[in-house]
């Protein structure tokens, strides 16, 4: 291990700078110019520089699990853990599930309504007495309820024509009822009798576009438990359908902006707010279905069985089960997705800050091992066949006494972990003897807490009247600076600077602000090595033959001189021995600028005065053409042609010189004039 | 990155001619300028030629009118064609390459002696 510190002063900042951290409280453990930052080492640093074991302050993290009898079946435990955490430093506890036999069960049978469901509403019907008889199999306490939805109320989900709104249905003739989007029809119940009677009662309905509105249902059954009754035992939500469904976005389609809010908006059993608010996303039904420990089973027909599959990856603790097209075979598709969500165990844990990271590792009845994964994970659990969680919690700073929940999804137990910061460091109490100190102050982990008025790392330095402020002052380069730059002690207004166990490194300079190191670095060396240059307070001196700001260049141009041995052609600078060119120049040497615009237009008027001593710089032809020089022979590079002052064309050529705006001209000894109407 | 191979070099009376080659490999598209520097005993080097990937050249007063820069093979060989040889262009000669920068690339170098 490892034992990053920053300006380190007392031994609780230490033990926050890593797990690796150790501090040493032995007297006179720093020698003079010794920082206290050097008392926080790893143990085997401070051993090797004579701290003595029981000198070494190393608070660890431990777990402490406390088991509550109290109370009916508990499938989970211990029901509580009390950490104290290190930073940096994991606390790990064990958590044993042991899945019960018999546990009590609601299950909420939620239907699609539109009208491709109808033969399906003729079977469900007569589902109740089935239901309950298939739920009393698995648990001596199972109670039924029924709800249904088709979708919002508005275009494009339903056809609002007045005739279509009464009556949905393709089939007129059909009694049929107006579409909804949620209706909660029965309150979770024992009696199939009811369950037969209120489920009787119900007409198919009917939409207009293919997905329905199943999330929004979903999301009222689950954050309305009052409402639908669920009890604090397993739950599950059969949702069945032979569609597609809406989510969040799909609103805008109605001119429906308003994020779902995740709130229950049931009023006389029916989601009358639906047109008001969007479709929830994925992520927070699941969210609010894991918060609420209900697990979805989606009864969807065999064209849809992939699509809902998909969405059991996002929902934890679902599954998917093949309906048959009139929904006939409901009872046993429901036993067999029961069974495989009670044997597969999530072990979980409610959102905490950044400040604590959990991992669990798992290991399961049948050998399977998952280590380091972000929550538990368990399948082919049996009845009283014990699992166990190993969980793993880290504080990554100091953290304020809180507490948070774990719990398998779809249960009720939880496990309630409380966290406490292990940061205090334990000293032998020698406060009493303030000799140490020169009498003027106490000793608190080998280090001297002064009385006021005395300063010091023994408290040796009388303030004589000036504040510690006012010393510390002299102390520090300007008012923002900390004293001594954080690299020396403040003795008596003076920096006394840290000798650095980094060798070749010297703190130094009134205010300690200097060292012999931190200077930009090449070839992994403080400015380039001995041989290139020293550092000296923050900058590179470089010896003769090396410049750059870590002493990284040689001090030559030859990369930088073209075939006249022009510096960058007179249009750049060089630095380092490579050209920085000005804009719009190319390296290596600033020769092309194939950006720049064509320099014709610009010389028409110095090639009409330098060959024919005419045009608007006729007069002073030199001082206004300054970059030109007229060649009596044919010049190699731009050919122009332009017309004058006189509107006759003019053919010439320019040749770049070096520098900027220098150019060889070459202009044809024939115009072309035009001659204009008579 | 780029490897570039010189040959053609070798011993030629005053007043002969040599033709040296530059083959480059590797990442070679993105080269818009290639250079023929030369070394003599004792002295600098010197750049002499110049040729851009727009195709225009530079040369150093010396051996202007003697020498001539080109490049072949889509810009992958450039030759430096010397005539008219002199004893003062007794040196090595290195062909150097730059990639949309500064010169980065150097070929190992090619003997040219111009005996008296």
């Known amino acids: 291990q490892e034992c990053t510190k920053f300006k380190v002063s007392s031994c609780r900042e230490c033990i926050e700078s890593g797990p690796g951290c150790t501090w040493c409280q032995k007297l006179n453990f720093t020698g003079p110019g010794d920082p206290d930052s050097i008392r926080c080492d790893t143990r085997p640093q401070l051993l090797m520089r004579g701290c003595a074991a029981d000198d070494i302050m190393d608070p660890t993290s431990l777990a402490e699990t406390q088991e509550d009898h109290n109370g009916g079946q508990k499938q989970l435990s211990p029901q509580k853990v009390t950490l104290y955490l290190r930073p940096g430093q994991a606390a790990a506890f064990n958590v044993t599930f042991r899945r019960a036999k018999g546990y009590p069960i609601d299950l909420y049978y939620l239907m699609d309504l539109s009208y491709s469901m109808l033969d399906d509403l003729r079977n469900v019907k007569k589902l109740g007495g089935d239901l309950l008889r298939a739920l009393n199999e698995i648990t001596e306490s199972g109670r039924i309820g029924f709800g249904s939805f088709v979708d919002k109320t508005v275009l494009p989900f339903v056809n609002t024509h007045p005739d279509k709104l009464r009556n949905p249905c393709p089939n007129k003739e059909k009694e049929c009822q107006p579409p909804f989007a949620f209706r909660h029809v029965l309150k979770l119940t024992n009696n199939s009798n009811q369950f037969q009677t209120e489920v009787g009662k119900q007409l198919i309905s009917g939409n207009l576009d293919a997905p329905e509105g199943g999330l929004d249902a979903m999301m009222q059954v689950a954050a309305c438990p009052e409402e639908i009754g669920w009890r604090n035992v397993t739950r599950l939500l059969v949702f069945a359908t032979d569609d597609g469904f809406h989510f969040a976005g799909d609103g805008k389609l109605g001119a429906i902006l308003t994020p779902n809010d995740g709130r229950c908006h049931l009023e006389d059993n029916l989601y009358k707010r639906s047109n008001e608010f969007d479709y929830p996303s994925v992520g927070q039904l699941a969210h609010k279905l894991a918060e609420n420990n209900i697990q979805p089973i989606f009864a969807v027909t065999s064209r849809m069985v992939k699509t809902y599959e998909k969405l059991t990856e996002i929902i934890p603790k679902s599954a998917v089960g093949e309906l048959s097209e009139d929904s006939s075979n409901v009872v046993h598709l429901i036993k067999n997705a029961y069974n495989k969500l009670s044997s597969r165990v999530f072990l979980d844990h409610n959102a905490l800050p950044d400040t604590l990271k959990v991992t669990y590792d798992s290991f399961c009845s049948n050998g399977v091992t998952h280590r380091n994964q972000p929550r538990g994970d368990c399948d082919g659990v049996q009845i009283n066949v014990p699992i166990t969680f190993q969980v793993k919690v880290t504080a990554t700073e100091c953290i304020q006494e809180q507490s948070f929940v774990i719990r398998a999804l779809g249960f009720t137990d939880i496990v309630t972990v409380q966290v406490l910061p292990q940061c205090e460091c334990r000293c032998r109490d020698q406060s009493r003897d303030r000799s140490l100190c020169h009498g003027k102050g106490f000793l608190e982990c080998g280090i001297c807490r002064c009385d006021t008025g005395y300063i010091g790392k023994n408290c040796e330095c009388q303030t004589q009247g000036r504040s510690s402020q006012e010393l510390e002052g002299s102390c520090r380069k300007d008012n923002n600076s900390i004293i001594c730059s954080g690299l020396g002690d403040c003795v008596c207004g003076q920096c006394l600077c840290h000798t650095s166990d980094v060798p070749g490194k010297l703190i130094y300079g009134q205010y300690c602000e200097c060292d012999t190191i931190n200077c930009e670095r090449y070839n992994g060396q403080v400015c380039g090595g001995p041989g290139r240059g020293l550092c000296f307070c923050g900058k590179c001196r470089c010896h003769p033959g090396f410049e750059g700001s870590a002493c990284q260049c040689e001090r030559t141009t030859e990369g930088c001189l073209n075939p006249r041995r022009v510096e960058c052609s007179g249009r750049g600078r060089c630095r380092c021995n490579v050209c920085e060119c000005h804009s719009g120049y190319q390296l290596p040497l600033c020769q092309e600028c194939p950006g720049c615009p064509s320099p014709c237009g610009k010389y028409i008027s110095c090639a009409e005065c330098l060959k024919f001593e005419k045009g608007p710089f006729g007069k002073n032809c030199s001082a206004a053409c300054p970059g030109l020089q007229l060649s009596n022979n044919p010049v190699k590079g731009r050919t122009c042609k332009e017309r004058d002052s006189e509107g006759c064309w003019v053919a010439y050529t320019l040749e770049q010189q070096d520098g900027m705006d220098r150019y060889l001209i070459y202009v044809d000894e024939s115009r072309e004039c035009v001659a204009g109407p008579n | 990155e780029v490897q570039l191979v010189e040959s053609g070099g070798g011993l030629v009376q005053t007043g002969g001619s040599l033709r040296l080659s530059c083959a480059a490999s590797g990442s070679t598209f993105n080269i818009n300028a290639w250079g023929w520097y030369r070394q003599a005993p004792g002295k600098q080097r010197e750049l002499v030629a110049v040729?851009?990937?727009?195709?225009?050249?530079d040369y150093s007063d010396a051996v202007k009118g003697r020498f001539t820069i080109s490049t072949v093979n889509a810009g992958n060989t450039v030759y430096l064609e010397m005539n008219s040889l002199k004893p003062e262009d007794t040196a090595v000669y290195y062909c150097?390459?730059?990639?949309?920068?500064?010169?980065?690339?150097w070929g190992q170098g090619s003997q040219v002696t111009v005996s008296s």
């Open positions: 040729i851009s990937s727009s195709g225009s050249t």
């Open positions: 150097r390459a730059a990639d949309s920068g500064p010169w980065r690339y």
